[in-house]
């Protein structure tokens, strides 16, 4: 007796986060001998699409022509062979950008710091929102959540940096969201580029979770130091 | 129990379209994709497409794209399927058909079907 | 298109009789094979699903069998109310096919 099919892989076109009315294909990959591929999406009750695979059979196209809010979510795919149904594939989570207002993002005191320095990213929106995401361009690992501790919403959210190096460097844009759908987040903020001039001592960030040795400087988590922010936000890496 | 109360028999004009309508009862319709199946006088069946009441999402036969467009109204439970172009070719009988399960695309369920005819 | 080819296309037999109904696909359809029951002026009743699964209140008189491409509907004691047309459907793939039909007449 075989084991279990080896489950299939899935991913979004042209990313999984996509912006109200844009176009966005989920693609489902599993194996030569799929004979169908199901798209599911939690918390929806019926399989949310079902397709025949294309040719050479080893993968299906799932198609959005207009991204909107109940696009969003979290989904897996299976394909079916002639043995029986795979096993899930990893999830996906499909964000929509666009769902609210723009915030603001500013750097305090200024957004260019001298290396060694401190610099704190102010994320600003006009509704009370209870998550904020601070993303760097170019960063492997983009997302840094503040989330508020018992859904009090909040105006802003504070990113700290110290001691800022060369790493912190680069443009930043920043997302405001609400807890009940972290899938729909607001429109960007406009782009913030923070500029760090050189000092004597160049001090490189402690990261606080290992990362790959291959990874070059952008490809290091955003690490922000220092204490929880005082707005009752609690830091939730992603 | 499960039952799939279909709209009347139509009586169409060459050129125009008409809108079916398939109203759901006995069950969670969210639940179920619904099939579409057109059956011409005393002929064989043919299977249109279908829909996921849930979200609206559709497949549809390569020869029926042109053809058919379904949709659902999930507040009243009812399926609908709008045929344009009207031909002759187009007198059928059509059914609404309801999805067996998750993990099965039987179809278990058939509405009463409703009878198109296309005529000048 | 997978397509589905029944035989007979017609046949008469007489009631206690047991008949035979069978379907082959133009390929292997992994037993995703559907039977339906058609009266004049009615709409299909589902007999049996994934090739030999009975659907629940049928009677235990019809069973499905077969697997690959060849399929069959057997009637193990002909009774009146069986008359009608028996159609197979594939679903194996999209989209999916139906048989042309066999009817049942009574002998």
């Known amino acids: 007796q075989a084991g279990p099919l080896p489950k299939p892989t899935l991913w979004a076109e042209p990313g999984s986060v996509i912006s109200w009315g844009n176009s966005v294909t989920i693609w489902c990959q599993g194996t030569l001998e799929a004979r169908e591929y199901r798209l599911d999406k939690e918390e929806s009750p019926a399989p949310w699409d079902r397709q025949n695979p294309l040719e050479p059979k080893n993968k299906a196209r799932f198609s959005i022509p207009s991204m909107t809010e109940d696009y969003a979510g979290r989904y897996r795919c299976y394909y079916r062979s002639p043995v029986g149904w795979s096993q899930p594939s990893d999830p996906l989570e499909l964000v929509m950008t666009g769902a609210y207002s723009k915030p603001t993002l500013s750097a305090l005191p200024s957004p260019l710091v001298t290396s060694g320095k401190s610099v704190t990213l102010l994320c600003q929106s006009r509704s009370p929102m209870d998550t904020f995401l601070l993303i760097k361009e170019r960063a492997a690992h983009p997302l840094l959540h503040l989330r508020s501790e018992h859904g009090a919403q909040q105006h802003q959210a504070e990113f700290p940096m110290s001691p800022v190096t060369s790493v912190h460097g680069g443009t930043y844009r920043c997302f405001s969201s609400h807890g009940f759908s972290h899938y729909l987040l607001s429109h960007p903020s406009d782009p913030l580029e923070l500029i760090v001039s050189g000092s004597l001592e160049d001090p490189r960030p402690s990261p606080t979770r290992s990362v790959s040795t291959a990874a070059g400087p952008e490809d290091q988590p955003l690490m922000p130091t220092g204490s929880v922010p005082h707005s009752g936000l609690r830091r939730h890496w992603e | 129990q499960v039952q799939l109360e279909q709209s009347g028999a139509e009586l169409v004009k060459p050129g125009a379209s008409v809108k079916l309508s398939c109203k759901a009862s006995?069950?969670?319709?969210?639940?179920?994709?619904m099939h579409w199946v057109k059956q011409r006088h005393g002929q064989g069946l043919e299977w249109i497409g279908e829909?996921?009441?849930?979200?609206?999402?559709?497949n549809y036969n390569e020869k029926f794209k042109t053809k058919a467009t379904l949709t659902v109204d999930k507040s009243s439970s009812t399926a609908y399927m709008q045929l344009s172009s009207l031909t002759s070719e187009d007198s059928a009988v059509y059914y609404c058909?309801?999805?067996?399960?998750?993990?099965?695309?039987?179809?278990?369920?058939w509405g009463q079907g409703t009878s198109v005819t296309v005529s000048s | 298109d997978i397509v589905l080819t029944q035989s007979p296309s017609s046949m008469y037999a007489s009631l206690g009789e047991r008949v035979t109904i069978t379907c082959k696909a133009s390929?292997?359809?992994?037993?995703?094979l559907s039977w339906f029951q058609q009266k004049p002026g009615k709409s299909p009743k589902t007999l049996i699903y994934?090739?030999?699964r009975l659907v629940d209140g049928v009677p235990s008189r019809f069973s499905g069998s077969g697997s690959g491409q060849d399929y069959s509907l057997t009637i193990s004691s002909l009774e009146y109310e069986d008359m009608g047309i028996y159609y197979c459907?594939?679903?194996?793939?999209?989209?999916?096919?139906f048989g042309a039909g066999t009817k049942l007449e009574l002998k």
């Open positions: 058909a309801k999805n067996y399960r998750y993990d099965d695309w039987a179809m278990d369920y």
């Open positions: 006995g069950y969670t319709f969210t639940n179920y994709w």
């Open positions: 829909i996921n009441p849930s979200n609206g999402r559709t």
């Open positions: 390929e292997d359809i992994n037993s995703y």
């Open positions: 994934r090739a030999n």
């Open positions: 459907l594939q679903y194996d793939e999209i989209p999916p096919t």
